[in-house]
Structures are given as C-alpha cells and as structure tokens.
C-alpha cells in the first residue's frame, strides 16, 4: 500500500481560554528525515492553512513566531496545540503530513478534528 494514513481525533473541545490540543499520528511508508505538518481549516468547500511546521525527525517541531500553533513531535506522532480560538473558529481542522525528504514524497491527510469553541461568559459587574 502506497498511501500514508493519518489519524486524528474526531472531536475536541477547546478550553475556556480558547486553547485546543490534539494528536496527529501518521503511519510512515518511507524513511523520512524531513517532515512537514500543516493544520488546515475546512469551512464549506474552502480550505485555508492555519499553520505549518517543518521538522527534522528527532528534532522539535518549530512553527513561525507569529503562529497560533505550537507542537511537539515524538516519532510518527505530533502533539498540536492551537491557541487564541473563539466561538467563530469552531470548525473542522485537518492534519496534513508530508514526507519531504528524502524522496519519494508522501502525502497524508487526516479526516479532520471538529474543534468546538465556546466563548466564556463575561464576568458580571460586582457591586462591592
């Protein structure tokens, strides 16, 4: 089988601080040393990139400084955290894994994690 399988949880509930974490695991058919992990958000038929990181196997996952994502990697498993989420960001978040180097290239796309975000209720004014 030449396809690369990617597994991720079906549903995740973001914390009251707007933080959601999930694991993205891939079954690598090749011996990649360089891997790219991308989080995509799918709304209707539109797919947009949320964040992406390229890492060397055995090294840490590094997102850009201004990214809303952070993560760690361990073997073929990536622990992803997305922060700054609001209710309007509720949606399907897809984990895409690409084995970049050495060739051959492999693409793996998860089924997506539905992240639910609930904005916290504002604190009532105190009369004290």
């Amino acid at each position: 089988c030449k396809a690369m399988h990617v597994a991720q949880p079906a549903v995740v509930l973001a914390s009251s601080r707007g933080i959601a974490s999930f694991v993205c695991e891939y079954a690598s058919p090749g011996k990649a040393t360089e891997v790219r992990v991308t989080v995509l958000r799918q709304a209707d038929s539109q797919v947009t990139e949320v964040c992406a990181a390229t890492y060397m196997m055995g090294n840490e996952l590094t997102f850009l400084d201004d990214s809303i994502c952070t993560g760690t990697s361990s073997g073929n498993q990536v622990n992803l955290t997305i922060q700054g989420l609001r209710a309007m960001d509720t949606g399907l978040y897809i984990c895409k894994v690409e084995l970049m180097y050495p060739p051959p290239y492999y693409l793996g796309i998860g089924n997506g994690t539905q992240i639910y975000v609930i904005d916290p209720e504002p604190c009532p004014d105190s009369d004290f």
Partner: antibody
Framework: QVQLVESGRGIVQPGRSLRLSCAAS????????MHWVRQSPGKGLDWVAF????????YYADSVKGRFTISRDNSKNTLYLQMNSLRAEDTAVYYC???????????WGQGTLVTVSS | EIVLTQSPGTLSLSPGERATLSCRAS???????LAWYQQKSGQAPRLLIY???SRATGIPDRFSGSGSGTDFTLTISRLEPEDFAVYYC?????????FGQGTKVEIK
C-alpha cells in the same frame, strides 16, 4: 483570481537548452508548491517536476532527471524550468500547475509549446 | 510508481446520457489522493474532483466521483454539450505523481 502564465516557447535543436517561465498572480505564490506537467502532441499528461514553496526540496520524473532543473523566485512570483540536453521526445506542451492545499493540481497555466527538432 | 489505467479509451454518447468512466490503480492509492481532470481541445486541464469524491470549486453537481482502494469512477449524470472532452484520473499521494492515459468522451 489565480492566474498562471507560461512563456519560453520555441523550436530548439536536440542537445540544446531552453528555459521556461511561469508568472503567477492572484494568490500568495510563496505559500504553494508548484509543478511542471507536459503533454506530447496527441498524448496524455506526464508529470515533470515539483518544487516546494520555499524552493528547498525538488522532485523530478526519471525521464528528465539530470537534464532539467526546476527553480523559483518568490520575490518575482515566478517558477522556472531549465531544460538542458533536449531530446526529440521532450517535444510537448509544458504546463505549470499549483499544488492545492489538499494535494491536487488545482490551477493550471495555458501551456507553452516546446519543439525539439533538427 | 502507481500506474493508473483508464477505461474505456473512448466513450461515444449523446447529450443527456449518463457517462461512467473508470480508473484502476496498480496498487492501493488512498481515496484521499485521487483526482479527476477535464481537458477540452487546445485548453489546459481543469480540476473536477479531488479526494475521489469531492467536487472542486465551481464544478456542476452532475459530476460525481466514487471509489476507493484500486477502483475509482467518474460519473457525469447527464451529458451537456460542453462535457465532451478528455478526462484524466491522477494520484497525488506520492511521487512520482501519475496520470491515467485518459478517456475521450465524444458525441455519438
């Protein structure tokens, strides 16, 4: 809207070189991997080469490996294909295509014809 | 590499009829990584279907894709005059990226 425009068409003799360009507009070029695909007259589609968004990693079809070089200049929103040691069997319409977020080739240029003949 | 074989080579049909095109992979190509393209004479290919069954932006719902594993199908429910063209399947799950040899849908 996404637009890809190839240039560099021409008739060249076997063994000579030619460089194709693909000017991109309507999207953030530096965020997308790019492909070259060719189509010989009256034939099907053949993938030629791929380059990552940052230009670091490149892949080639066996038929062009060692002869063709794919490159890009993200500051100019342009993709290139340097073709050396051209052969008659390289005669084709060459298309540049964008690798979509989910993997398929979601946008294509109009193509440019390269004829290798003595 | 994954070899894709399309059948039939040519399909002769009339407008309004249903077209069924087949694409068989030499080894399992995950359904997430199978696309269909349409190419009209003298034009560039156009993405119709990706992930075996998802329609690309702006593609009419008379086009549908199905299948998994090694067998995939493109169906055009009712052929319109502008649908007569060549159709290619493609796998994009690993390099080298490969295309089928194409199926020509012509007017009967």
């Amino acid at each position: 809207q996404v637009q890809l425009v190839e240039s560099g068409r021409g008739i060249v003799q076997p063994g000579r070189s030619l460089r194709l360009s693909c000017a991109a507009s309507g999207f953030t070029f530096s965020s997308y991997g790019m492909h070259w695909v060719r189509q010989s007259p009256g034939k099907g589609l053949d993938w030629v080469a791929f380059i990552w968004d940052d230009g670091k990693n490149k892949y080639y079809a066996d038929s062009v490996k060692g002869r063709f070089t794919i490159s890009r200049d993200n500051s100019k929103n342009t993709l290139y294909l340097q073709m050396n040691s051209l052969r008659a069997e390289d005669t084709a319409v060459y298309y540049c295509a964008r690798k979509g977020q989910l993997g398929p080739f979601d946008s294509w240029g109009q193509g440019t014809l390269v004829t290798v003949s003595s | 590499e994954i070899v894709l074989t399309q059948s039939p080579g040519t399909l002769s049909l009339s407008p309004g009829e249903r077209a069924t095109l087949s694409c068989r992979a030499s080894q399992r190509a995950g359904s997430s990584y199978l696309a269909w393209y349409q190419q009209k004479s003298g034009q560039a290919p156009r993405l119709l279907i990706y992930g075996a069954s998802s329609r690309a932006t702006g593609i009419p719902d008379r086009f549908s894709g199905s299948g998994s594993g090694t067998d995939f199908t493109l169906t055009i429910s009712r052929l319109e005059p502008e649908d007569f063209a060549v159709y290619y399947c493609q796998q994009y799950g690993n390099s080298p990226w490969t295309f089928g040899q194409g199926t020509k849908v012509e007017i009967k």
